[in-house]
């Protein structure tokens, strides 16, 4: 039975040209995290595998950085980066948990970030 829950940063905004940290946290389960995928609706960005380490999709190599932790840092943001992002936690024995983050990249310099996310 899957008892865990994923906490995410929810809806966040950032300034064009800047950086943003995408962060999720899996709680309320003792399941072992074997892999975390970071994906857009139609594109794999990166994988953090417990054994293999980080693997960044080659097309994002220049502007995606691993971490902090199991999170992902997006750099040199463009308006085209606006959209949904998913953290997909592969766990044993529970199975797969998916969290959703919506990022809005703003043209102006008054982009207000959502409440800072902290891992307990």
């Amino acid at each position: 039975m899957m008892t865990g829950t994923i906490e995410t940063t929810g809806n966040i905004s950032a300034e064009k040209g800047g950086s943003i940290i995408l962060q999720c946290h899996l709680s309320s389960t003792t399941a072992q995290v074997t892999q975390v995928n970071w994906e857009q609706q139609d594109q794999l960005l990166a994988i953090c595998n417990a054994d293999l380490g980080w693997h960044i999709s080659p097309s994002f190599k220049d502007r995606v950085a691993p971490g902090p932790g199991l999170g992902l840092t997006l750099q040199s943001l463009t308006v085209n980066d606006t959209g949904e992002y998913f953290c997909i936690y592969h766990t044993y024995p529970d199975g797969t948990y998916t969290g959703r983050i919506f990022l809005e990249v703003l043209e102006s310099s008054v982009a207000e970030h959502g409440a800072r996310f902290q891992i307990p």
């Epitope: 594109q43 794999l44 595998n49 054994d51 380490g53 693997h55 999709s57 080659p58 097309s59 998916t98």
Partner: antibody
Framework: QVQLQQPGAELVKPGASVKMSCKAS????????MHWVKQTPGRGLEWIGA????????SYNQKFKGKATLTADKSSSTAYMQLSSLTSEDSAVYYC??????????????WGAGTTVTVSA | DIVMTQSPDSLAVSLGERVTMNCKSS????????????LAWYQQKPGQSPKLLIY???TRESGVPDRFSGSGSGTDFTLTISSVQAEDVAVYYC?????????FGGGTKLEIK
């Protein structure tokens, strides 16, 4: 163009070890995971494990832990798999295969031609 | 581990005939959060390495003829060849692309009558 070059055949004695190579060319070696797959007439295709040439991290199918050891040499863009304590059960074709990113998926997009390992006294 | 079961083991068809082969997984390969199925199909012709045909259960790899199509979701998947050609003689494998260890089906061997 992407190429994965493997030696055609290896003849080894029972109890010995063999180290086979997979030389990659035509792409950035450290940007892609490399996998190894075993094929026998009886059991079909079996995933042995993978290596991240960038970090050196490895992941193994539990069945092949202790049997296979994966390494990679960044300077020569070559992945290696060593098989130890060989028996007739290890006689098979061994493929190296790269995974590329296809949308949301990591897919075996390029395969070597395979190395046929024959274990015989 | 996810067990992949293919059926039939083999089939012989006439040129131009429509053929379907099935693949069943012991666990769901669907991530319902993003509505993606982590299943791939490979074709292996005699004496050759496997070649990618379809990924994501239904997306054809570039250069694969449109007579090949994939369908299904969750645990049940199908590969269809709408009009079999002589060059389609091969063994077809489905593969769990969802989680390690990646696992393959036992294959379906396609022959021409």
């Amino acid at each position: 163009q992407v190429q994965l070059q493997q030696p055609g055949a290896e003849l080894v004695k029972p109890g010995a070890s063999v180290k086979m190579s997979c030389k990659a060319s035509g792409y950035a070696f450290t940007n892609y995971l490399m996998h190894w797959v075993k094929q026998t007439p009886g059991r079909g295709l079996e995933w042995i494990g993978a290596i991240n040439p960038g970090s050196g991290g490895t992941s193994y199918n539990q069945k092949f832990k202790g049997k296979a050891t994966l390494t990679a040499d960044k300077s020569s863009s070559t992945a290696y798999m060593q098989l130890s304590s060989l028996t007739s059960e290890d006689s098979a074709v061994y493929y190296c295969a790269r995974t590329g990113v296809y949308g949301n998926f990591l897919i075996f997009d390029y395969w070597g031609a395979g190395t046929t390992v024959t274990v015989s006294a | 581990d996810i067990v992949m079961t293919q059926s039939p083991d083999s089939l012989a068809v006439s040129l131009g005939e429509r053929v379907t082969m099935n693949c069943k997984s012991s666990q769901s390969l669907l991530n319902s959060g993003i509505q993606k199925n982590y299943l791939a199909w490979y074709q292996q012709k005699p004496g050759q390495s496997p070649k990618l045909l379809i990924y994501g259960a239904s997306t054809r790899e570039s250069g694969v003829p449109d007579r090949f199509s994939g369908s299904g979701s969750g645990t049940d998947f199908t590969l269809t060849i709408s009009s079999v050609q002589a060059e389609d003689v091969a063994v077809y494998y489905c593969q769990n692309d969802h989680r390690y260890p990646f696992t393959f089906g036992g294959g379906t061997k396609l022959e021409i009558k």
